[in-house]
Interface confidence: medium
Amino acid sequence: GCLSQLYANTFFRGGDLAAIYTPDAQHCQKMCTFHPRCLLFSFLAVSPTKETDKRFGCFMKESITGTLPRIHRTGAISGHSLKQCGHQLSACHQDIYEGLDMRGSNFNISKTDSIEECQKLCTNNIHCQFFTYATKAFHRPEYRKSCLLKRSSSGTPTSIKPVDNLVSGFSLKSCALSEIGCPMDIFQHFAFADLNVSHVVTPDAFVCRTVCTFHPNCLFFTFYTNEWETESQRNVCFLKTSKSGRPSPPIIQENAVSGYSLFTCRKARPEPCHFKIYSGVAFEGEELNATFVQGADACQETCTKTIRCQFFTYSLLPQDCKAEGCKCSLRLSTDGSPTRITYEAQGSSGYSLRLCKVVESSDCTTKINAR
Amino acid sequence: IVGGTNSSLGEWPWQVSLQVKLVSQNHMCGGSIIGRQWILTAAHCFDGIPYPDVWRIYGGILNLSEITNKTPFSSIKELIIHQKYKMSEGSYDIALIKLQTPLNYTEFQKPICLPSKADTNTIYTNCWVTGWGYTKERGETQNILQKATIPLVPNEECQKKYRDYVITKQMICAGYKEGGIDACKGDSGGPLVCKHSGRWQLVGITSWGEGCARKEQPGVYTKVAEYIDWILEKIQSSKERALETSPA
């Protein structure tokens, strides 16, 4: 179930997945929630003696059992990911951090009259992930009322330092507040030849688009279908970027599909989950568990309830079926996407719905009361 | 159009703008409405981009700069490029577009008459070419639809001007000996219309030329009268296919 409590002066030992810098524990929890494998986190609000660079460190962790040994550590805050917390799921982070310099690659500097205006500039700049604003009391006069737009390869600061009269915050694109616009076009038979930031295996261009939307540096994508001539690139989703923020003119290419990230959308922003079940398809990955259930929908439900499960394959092969149902293989990978997709008539595959805002249930959230 | 003037709204109601929506949206070619669901244009417009789903067709438009993302457009249901067309030659430069949904005819958007097969030898005297193309060889697309009157040039004479190319009987030429008025880049696929016996007919489809409006280098157009059978056959076979697939 959903575990939203935070543990003060507590640090989880072991299970390390990744370490990043975040300005507070809430932001660290958010980063853990949207990381494909993170289940637990520990955040250092104060720096250990002699290790000043560890302050603001957010340590993302995983565990087979769902828990890790706790050790006492002053100034540490630990907690769980909110992967199974339905309504609490949001990538939006509106907090402003006074006295902090969130460092990254400064790609734009301009004068603005307020922090709000600076945050708006960042929200409406395609490349901006976070920002730092120097107030009118900042010690260097030439930087006063300066708005620095920043980015990094992870989408989070490369370091965080306490500096008086600096204020930092994040882009509000994930809050659906960007005014950049929402290019929903999908180009059949076109490929973008721009810089690849990453690639993942996906069953279709729509999943590719959602992956792109939630990747910190993906602006557009090209997906190669199962008919693509190079076998190693079939069902591969290339996440792309460019200096200009726009793709170069697309190349005509049969069996390629291209489109844009929807991270600047206001209404059409997708959820970080994929509802569709793909019949005739098998998703390969690290095996977590196998159970026997009746139907692919039940298999998806099992995967969703198993916190570490990222995707599943349901097999209807005679040797995979028993009286209580057929084999439901729960799987995971380092990036949350299948390591390979194969086409098998007797299989159905899909994804966990653990990151869906509203996991469908018969209980209505809005009740209509009889008068 | 080089040496042309601004048109007024509804003056050439059959003229459409064929635009491509990729990273940005751009006018690529002209076309002519010949039926509620049919546009006639040049095959070479689709050379680089033969995928129907990226094309948008705007009718009843005078000023391209007034097109916004709210402006209604038609989409391509079927693209029929002449089977003998090769982009490495100028011949058979003709294509039919079947629209997803039929057009509503208005005073600003209605069809142009096709000539009959018997019109292959008709002598036309009042001919006009229209389009949003360049106004000079190294120019840019125009916002307001341009028009220019232009005399037809006999094929034998045209062939003499184009010694390096074959001017076939499926082509028709138009232009002034001294140059100065012609179709240009971006006018491709658009209409060359002539008023004959009181009504406008689609005589040519803008196809190619040596530069634009050069002296002794007339514009070359696809001669529509030579393709009447092909046009009618394609429209008919499309209707028959639609009947086969419609529910009983």
């Epitope: 190349i251 | 050379d47 982009m87 430069d93 880049k185 006018d187 196809s207 190619w208 030329g209």
Partner: antibody, heavy 126, light 107 residues
């Protein structure tokens, strides 16, 4: 099958002359523009000259203008390059190539070189 | 004259790698850009014309894009036979000019 075969290359002294020929087969020679391109040893490609199908229009690179003459004999399916006042910097492999016609956006251009001969070496040296 | 600048001047890649070569024109040339491949001691071979059109017989792992001044040749999955020199060439106006070439080696 389109074939282009150059001949006439060889060693020549500075100030001397050579005439290169290119025999064409497998296509209607009289319908295509033809091009000469050269490549100095270990260097890149350099366009030299171009002739229209009828032979009525020719163009040259500045480096050869006034010294080289391109011509064709459509009855013999042959392209020629007459090279006079040769210089050491004219040393190169000379290729003849066919110009492909491209119709795009109302422009019909001999726009790309779709078939090439195997080349003939011209060495200008004393 | 229009200058054509190719980059990189040489590259070394593994079989299966995605390779991108860029070509920049000193002034806009619409789509009048062609790509050729030349193996040592052989004549050049046309790969792509009009910026993005694949010459018949050329494998579809090769593709071209661009318009105006910036152009790209992409080999989606490098094969052993793809080694050699690649040249871009503009035919917007005479004199037709070539890029300096990109030497592609297989690691």
């Amino acid at each position: 099958e389109v074939q282009l075969l150059e001949s006439g290359g060889g060693l020549v002294q500075p100030g001397g002359s050579l005439r290169l020929s290119c025999a064409a087969s497998g296509f209607t020679f009289s319908a295509y523009s033809m091009i000469w391109v050269r490549q100095a040893p270990g260097k890149g490609l350099e366009w030299v000259s171009y002739i229209r199908p009828s032979g009525g229009r020719t163009t040259y690179a500045d480096s050869v203008k006034g010294r080289f003459t391109i011509s064709r004999d459509n009855s013999k399916n042959t392209l020629y390059l007459q090279m006079n006042s040769l210089r050491a910097e004219d040393t190169a492999v000379y290729y003849c190539a066919r110009g492909g016609l491209l119709l795009w956006n109302r422009e019909l251009k001999s726009n790309y070189f779709d078939y090439w001969g195997q080349g003939t070496l011209v060495t200008v040296s004393s | 004259d229009i200058q054509m600048t190719q980059s990189p001047s040489s590259l070394s890649a593994f079989v299966g790698d995605r390779v991108t070569i860029t070509c920049r024109a000193s002034q806009p040339i619409d789509n009048y850009l062609n790509w050729y491949h030349q193996k040592p001691g052989k004549a050049p071979k046309l790969l792509i014309y009009a910026a993005s059109r694949l010459q018949s017989g050329v494998p579809s792992r090769l593709s071209g894009s661009g318009f105006g001044t910036d152009f790209t040749l992409t080999i989606s999955s490098l094969q052993p036979e793809d080694f050699g020199n690649y040249y871009c060439q503009q035919s917007y106006t005479v004199p037709y000019t070539f890029g300096g070439g990109t030497k592609v080696e297989i690691r």
